[in-house]
Amino acid sequence: AVDLTLLANLRLTDPQRFFLTCVSGEAGAGRGSDAWGPPLLLEKDDRIVRTPPGPPLRLARNGSHQVTLRGFSKPSDLVGVFSCVGGAGARRTRVIYVHNSPGAHLLPDKVTHTVNKGDTAVLSARVHKEKQTDVIWKSNGSYFYTLDWHEAQDGRFLLQLPNVQPPSSGIYSATYLEASPLGSAFFRLIVRGCGAGRWGPGCTKECPGCLHGGVCHDHDGECVCPPGFTGTRCEQACREGRFGQSCQEQCPGISGCRGLTFCLPDPYGCSCGSGWRGSQCQEACAPGHFGADCRLQCQCQNGGTCDRFSGCVCPSGWHGVHCEKSDRIPQILNMASELEFNLETMPRINCAAAGNPFPVRGSIELRKPDGTVLLSTKAIVEPEKTTAEFEVPRLVLADSGFWECRVSTSGGQDSRRFKVNVKVPPVPLAAPRLLTKQSRQLVVSPLVSFSGDGPISTVRLHYRPQDSTMDWSTIVVDPSENVTLMNLRPKTGYSVRVQLSRPGEGGEGAWGPPTLMTTDCPEPLLQPWLEGWHVEGTDRLRVSWSLPLVPGPLVGDGFLLRLWDGTRGQERRENVSSPQARTALLTGLTPGTHYQLDVQLYHCTLLGPASPPAHVLLPPSGPPAPRHLHAQALSDSEIQLTWKHPEALPGPISKYVVEVQVAGGAGDPLWIDVDRPEETSTIIRGLNASTRYLFRMRASIQGLGDWSNTVEESTLGNGLQAEGPVQESRAAEEGLDQ
């Protein structure tokens, strides 16, 4: 089970002093920002028990493995469900604490009820302040049952839940009708997924026999030990005031664990610390009782005395839970409750025993989970004990489980079970990622998802040029940092692989899949300069540039021209893919725009230094075309043109330009300016008689605008040849009057 404890400080005289602390004993717990462990989360869960909104609670992190919730301003802030989430991946675990108001109408006799599948659970709500109305029971916030107030037995309302199943788990409450929900008695029911003493997917496996009130986890068969006890079977008491799976945590304050409720992963639930009992965990155990909630009885024999924290303290010459074992009986000494080895290793396991008669090498044996018995290969005999050493054959995954060291002499026998975890060395599932590259170095992220078991202790990066038979270069790196491979060859492909290791002998995993990473080519060093440019239209610009002359071949693949439109905050890039090019035509630019222009040489993906910038102003585009152009012959040498002004003008028209061309003629057209822009009519004179002409016109503001539609008209016939067309302009009405 995950080593996660939620502590509630129940000294309730002042809610502002109340706090909840979540402590994780997991390696790397709560580091959050790195890839190895999500942070501890501690929060109030308002989904079932809703309380009036108050100021937000304050969350304080104390190092990587502890988080504390404070800021409770009134007693009602405390009522309800709190949860702490810790552990990574599949081991992510939620620990739940249910807080009842000490002033509620109904109070739970016992808040947490852990029962086995198929059992009958009985929840008991004690009357604290009587009301003569129905009592409503709810399950996870939904109506469940009603009791008449007359149905109280001994001042308690009982809810019997026969044949409970795992879905029955959750938060139960008992409330008087019309009473505030805050006056309810809140309970937590935990239903193990198996019957008593069983665990596993089909509940086929037998629990190890958890001692001192430990509860067998229905998924993994491990004992979840009460606070203050440790060991595979919770057989060992911690020193007073200590808790955690290895007794590594210490209760805060001078009064030790007094006034603290401890909540552990399901199926344990919550209890007082060892040596304490009562609704607020402030009462010491009565004589003869010990452990969490003082639920255990000492029953010491042979002159043993009862310690409320650890149970029987035996006089010399005796040992055992009740001091029932004579020291003459052999005894296994100081056996670790849990050992961890890597797959396919051949570890040595030591088992020490004492007794009278003295144990010898052949009297100590090691039994694997599959029943195989190993005999020790050597023994170290000391005055007070014999230590047998066992050479374990190559470990396989099936060796995970409970092993047993057994000693047998004529004085009797003793055995000690301990858990062996066979861990699979980590193997990367993916290749490392290339972050950035230069001509002589690659920056690589070595951290990838992996199969097998963590934690990752070291990361090795192996690399060598592609298709090379030379030895691999290896760099050992910190798991959480990116790696820079240096002193590489430019424009070269490298094969790069990751190898992960976990702690312990044989913890190195197989190499991960290779990936090809290629260094960049050399950076281009030459700086071009702009020779000149000229505008070829309102949206076209021709640019030319030069490069300094240097000996040797040119390092570059082409040029990049950059135009920056500062007004709009837009950049236009034009790629010239020949290193020999020294000119380029830029089209599709925005008329009337002020551009900053520069050019730089590129090689592969690398850019050389940019030329000093030039500033270019494109002329603005002209106005829209004049509308409804019409031609009307007046004589054998005159044609009158009429039109309407363009719409949506960006400014005042400076002039109109008329284009005149003989229809079907091969010569250049003639352009005639109409310098009075307010006119909407003009007469073109000096035309040839009986000749078909094409006309179109455009307006000019700062630049020339779009051409109008083209119109055709023929002069009248008299056979005379004119000198050439000229124009006369007047108001349209005047022309019509004539």
């Epitope: 129905d134 409503i136 049952y145 009603t146 008449d148 019309e178």
Partner: antibody, heavy 119, light 109 residues
Framework: EVQLLESGGGLVQPGGSLRLSCAAS????????MIWVRQAPGKGLEWVSG????????GYADSVKGRFTISRDNSKNTLYLQMNSLRAEDTATYYC????????????WGQGTLVTVSS | QSELTQPRSVSGSLGQSVTISCTGT?????????VSWYQQYPGRAPKLIIH???RRPSGVSDRFSGSKSGNTASLTISGLQAEDEADYYC?????????FGSGTQVTVL
């Protein structure tokens, strides 16, 4: 869907007995209070009797106390009303209704069964 | 256990509002906020239209509204429609079980 179906009504002579049943479905019968309500022809509704989920607590209107007995069989999802010493004024349509639990109101009703006490 | 007092009948024109009162004692209406109202058509079972004094079950028109003051609860039907013509009963929790009103016939003119 919650359904309540009454049965057992009919014609009975004064002083006689009758047992009404109410078959419940569509909800967890063993969790809810149940009640009987009656309505004499052309008259209003009158609460007759009620029983808590466990069957351990019951209540009766003064007009039927000592003559009527309410009971339930949670294994059969059925509510009963045993009516003894019937009188002409017990003539009515008898409805079985479910108490809403945390909604404190008879929320679902059966269609009723008619009991006629007449000689 | 005496029944709650309601007017024998009330009437109103189409589109008008009518209010039905329901008077109890300090042991029922005055003590608990568990007053409900039922609509009953002839020959049919009662249908719940208001519970907990003011709350409407889903599917019940928002033209029906409930209120309570002291020992008296009220049901208001606004925008009276032809289908509202029925008998209406109030009901109050009275500790353990219930007491019903005498019933009010609503006529739509």
């Amino acid at each position: 869907e919650v359904q309540l179906l009454e049965s057992g009504g009919g014609l009975v002579q004064p002083g006689g007995s009758l047992r009404l049943s109410c078959a419940a479905s569509g909800f967890t019968f063993s969790s809810y209070k149940m009640i009987w309500v009656r309505q004499a022809p052309g008259k209003g509704l009158e609460w007759v009797s009620g029983i808590y989920p466990s069957g351990g607590a019951t209540g009766y209107a003064d007009s039927v106390k000592g003559r009527f007995t309410i009971s339930r069989d949670n294994s059969k999802n059925t509510l009963y009303l045993q009516m003894n010493s019937l009188r002409a004024e017990d003539t009515a349509t008898y409805y079985c209704a479910r108490d809403g639990g945390d909604i404190v109101v008879p929320d679902y009703w059966g269609q009723g069964t008619l009991v006629t006490v007449s000689s | 256990q005496s029944e709650l007092t309601q007017p024998r009948s009330v009437s109103g024109s189409l589109g008008q509002s009518v209010t039905i009162s329901c008077t109890g004692t300090t042991s029922d209406v005055g003590r608990y906020n568990f007053v409900s109202w039922y609509q009953q058509y002839p020959g049919r079972a009662p249908k719940l239209i208001i519970h907990d004094v003011t709350r409407r079950p889903s599917g019940v028109s928002d033209r029906f509204s409930g209120s309570k003051s002291g020992n008296t609860a009220s049901l208001t039907i606004s925008g009276l429609q032809a289908e509202d013509e029925a008998d209406y009963y109030c009901c109050s929790y009275a500790g353990s079980f219930y007491v019903f009103g005498s019933g009010t016939q609503v006529t739509v003119l």
